[in-house]
């Protein structure tokens, strides 16, 4: 492979916004390799050497009127200006999350399981995910992947609930996000749809069988009684 | 008080590769970068270009200054080179996986420097290039880098995928595997027994009941026919 030594220069101009643009902090930072050498901090008002390597730059830039003036004005001319340019499609961007619930392991009822609430494709990243069991919030046994940035202006997160599902229980994943006015909810019932249909089929079949058997026996025995007694007199035609 | 938002103009210049980058970052997401070869602004999402504009020439001027500054700093540091920091790699999907439902595999390459990586997608061990996309090098708060690579795919139980990453900080290429984890159905024993028994009993009941009904009806019919002439 290519084993030549590498040398990296990394300038970063950072604008930190608090309460919209009410308070703004501007940082003009310079990194040689991975080490910051010199920076301008609007809270300080002049360039400062971070390491000895940056001392000549701090001294020179502080002496340069244009450079210093520009850095000092940057909270307005650069930060607030750029915020105004991008605000509509960044600060105000809203994408609704897609919520799905599924068990992570295919376990029978009354066995330990992890219920997964998958929340995906949302923006911005601020989100609140809660689990409810039969309407009561579950605070213990929650595990989360944390916020995952997809790199395409969407986020995802998985919030798992450790539980032992019992028949008839209703689990609800509730999601609060700036893109929606009221919370999104997705339910999961402790018995699966296939299990439920199997139970219904079994019980339904059993009941139907009993009905048929009962009806058959009733008709059969009613007619059986008629054989031992007198036959009714036929009507004359 | 924690800040609400951060906008970063991040640049770098790397020698001897002579590679440079200029990008704007909003809360960790790329707004745009400048394609140095094409000398044009590339918006991360196409619609961003409808709301704003950026003169790519300004970025090229910055990169020229960065190149000059790197040479000064390299000399000043007595040619101290960067220490390679190997990446951490994670493969995940864009959304929950469903068979034959289009999805996207994401290869997240994180916490590395210098900003040079070679990334390959493998399907069943063979390189895939169709539909793949990637981000530029994204800045981190610790001044290392992040990068995303994407592969659109159709989930199936037959295919396995790998994201193969090469970096000077790694002794050998790093492979991160992904395959479809088909959920095995629940062993619904109780339900199966109830269903089987219920249907069996039901079927038997229906058959026997039907026989009794038929016999009962026949008997009643026969008795009617035996009335006075």
């Amino acid at each position: 492979g290519d084993t030549r030594p590498r040398f990296l220069w990394q300038p970063k101009r950072e604008c930190h916004f608090f309460n919209g643009t009410e308070r703004v902090r501007f940082l003009d930072r310079y990194f040689y390799n991975q080490e910051e050498s010199v920076r301008f901090d609007s809270d300080v008002g002049e360039f400062r050497a971070v390491t000895e390597l940056g001392r000549p730059d701090a001294e020179y830039w502080n002496s340069q009127k244009d450079i210093l003036e520009q850095a000092r004005a940057a909270v307005d001319t650069y930060c607030r200006h750029n915020y105004g340019v991008v605000e509509s499609f960044t600060v105000q961007r809203r994408v609704q999350p897609k919520v799905t619930v599924y068990p992570s392991k295919t376990q029978p009822l009354q066995h330990h399981n992890l219920l997964v609430c998958s929340v995906s494709g949302f923006y911005p990243g601020s989100i609140e995910v809660r689990w409810f069991l039969n309407g009561q919030e579950e605070k213990a046994g929650m595990v989360s992947t944390g916020l995952i940035q997809n790199g395409d202006w969407t986020f995802q997160t998985l919030v798992m609930l450790e539980t032992v599902p019992r028949s008839g229980e209703v689990y609800t994943c509730q999601v609060e996000h700036p893109s929606v006015t009221s919370p999104l909810t997705v339910e999961w019932r402790a018995r699966s749809e296939s299990a439920q249909s199997k139970m219904l089929s079994g019980v339904g079949g059993f009941v139907l069988g009993l009905l048929f058997l009962g009806a058959g026996l009733f008709i059969y025995f009613r007619n059986q009684k008629g054989h031992s007694g007198l036959q009714p007199t036929g009507f004359l035609s | 008080i924690k800040e609400e938002h951060v906008i970063i103009q991040a640049e770098f210049y790397l020698n001897p590769d002579q590679s440079g980058e200029f990008m704007f970052d909003f809360d960790g997401d790329e707004i745009f970068h400048v394609d140095m070869a094409k000398k044009e602004t590339v918006w991360r999402l196409e619609e961003f270009g409808r709301f704003a504009s950026f003169e790519a020439q300004g970025a090229l001027a910055n990169i020229a200054v960065d190149k000059a500054n790197l040479e000064i700093m390299t000399k000043r540091s007595n040619y101290t080179p960067i220490t390679n920091v190997p990446p951490e790699v994670t493969v995940l999907t864009n959304s929950p996986v469903e068979l034959r439902e289009p999805n996207v595999l994401i290869c997240f390459i994180d916490k590395f420097t210098p900003p040079v990586v070679n990334v390959t997608w493998l399907r069943n061990g063979k390189p895939v290039t169709t539909g793949v996309s990637e981000t530029v090098f994204l800045p981190r708060e610790d001044h290392l880098f992040r990068k995303f690579h994407y592969l659109p795919f159709l989930p199936s139980t037959e295919d396995v995928y790998d994201c193969r990453v090469e970096h000077w900080g790694l002794d050998e290429p790093l492979l991160k595997h992904w395959e479809f984890d088909a959920p095995s159905p629940l062993p619904e024993t109780t339900e199966n027994v109830v269903c089987a028994l219920g249907l069996t009993v039901g079927l038997v009941g229906i058959i026997i009941g039907t026989i009794f009904i038929i016999k009962g009806v026949r008997k009643s019919n026969a008795a009617e026919r035996r009335g006075p002439l």
């Epitope: 703004v24 609007s42 008002g45 502080n62 002496s63 340069q64 009127k65 244009d66 210093l68 003036e69 520009q70 000092r72 004005a73 909270v75 307005d76 | -």
Partner: antibody, heavy 132, light 107 residues
């Protein structure tokens, strides 16, 4: 029309503090396109810039290295004025002291990309003698 | 600190003459230079900023030129009210510095 009006004693004893104020009319000390300077003139030194104060979202001060250890320039927004304090004076500090507005001309009138400058408004000057 | 050297230190001229004053900087200052006129007992008055931009209200007979280290103030046709001392000042770097002055006297 912008005007600057000086006030302060004309005689200061050595080792004491020289204090001058400059009242602004027709502009604001918090202006976003100006800085407020103190300059002195003496036969031996000629015109000498001492320092300045100005506002750009916060207050900034810049001082000449020759006086940095003993100078303070303060803005007073309530009175729309700014002051000069020069500590530990010596006869060498005897001079005519001027306050002046440095105008930040917009990039459209300058050769360069950002600003260009000129001391476009001056006070009438105050003669300060340091003597016991 | 950047030194500004003005030449000549004094000159004698007549009304209607074309007068040229030079200012040399000890290092490059781009176009960050201003010219002032000062009359005895008065404060300096701004004539030119950014090396060649004429301050509003200043007669057009005054002009400035130059960039880097060499600058010139020209009075195309000297008027009686122009007899004064002229100073250059640099705005490139701190501390801000002035030239030693050029006294324009009546011949």
């Amino acid at each position: 029309q912008v005007q600057l009006q000086h006030s302060g004693p004309g005689l200061v004893k050595p080792s004491q503090t020289l204090s001058l104020t400059c009242a602004i009319s027709g502009d604001s000390v918090s202006s976003n396109s100006a800085s407020w300077n103190w300059i002195r003139q003496s036969p031996s030194r000629g015109l000498e810039w001492l320092g300045r104060t100005y506002y750009r979202s916060k207050w900034y001060n810049d001082y000449a290295v020759s006086v940095k250890s003993r100078i303070v320039i303060n803005p007073d927004t309530s009175k729309n004025q700014f002051s000069l304090q020069l500590n530990s004076v010596t006869p060498e500090d005897t001079a005519v002291y001027y306050c002046a507005r440095e105008n930040f001309y917009g990039s459209e009138t300058c050769h360069k990309k950002y600003y260009c400058y000129g001391m476009d408004v001056w006070g009438q000057g105050t003669t300060v003698t340091v003597s016991s | 600190a950047i030194q500004l050297t003005q030449s000549p230190s004094s000159l004698s001229a007549s009304v209607g003459d074309r007068v040229t004053i030079t200012c040399r900087a000890s290092q490059g200052i781009s176009s960050a230079l201003a010219w002032y006129q000062q009359k005895p007992g008065k404060a300096p008055k701004l004539l030119i900023y950014d090396a060649s931009s004429l301050e509003s209200g200043v007669p057009s007979r005054f002009s400035g030129s130059g960039s880097g280290t060499d600058f010139t103030l020209t009075i195309s046709s000297l008027q009686p009210e122009d007899f004064a001392t002229y100073y250059c000042q640099q705005f490139n770097s701190f501390p801000l510095t002035f030239g030693g002055g050029t006294k324009v006297e009546i011949k």
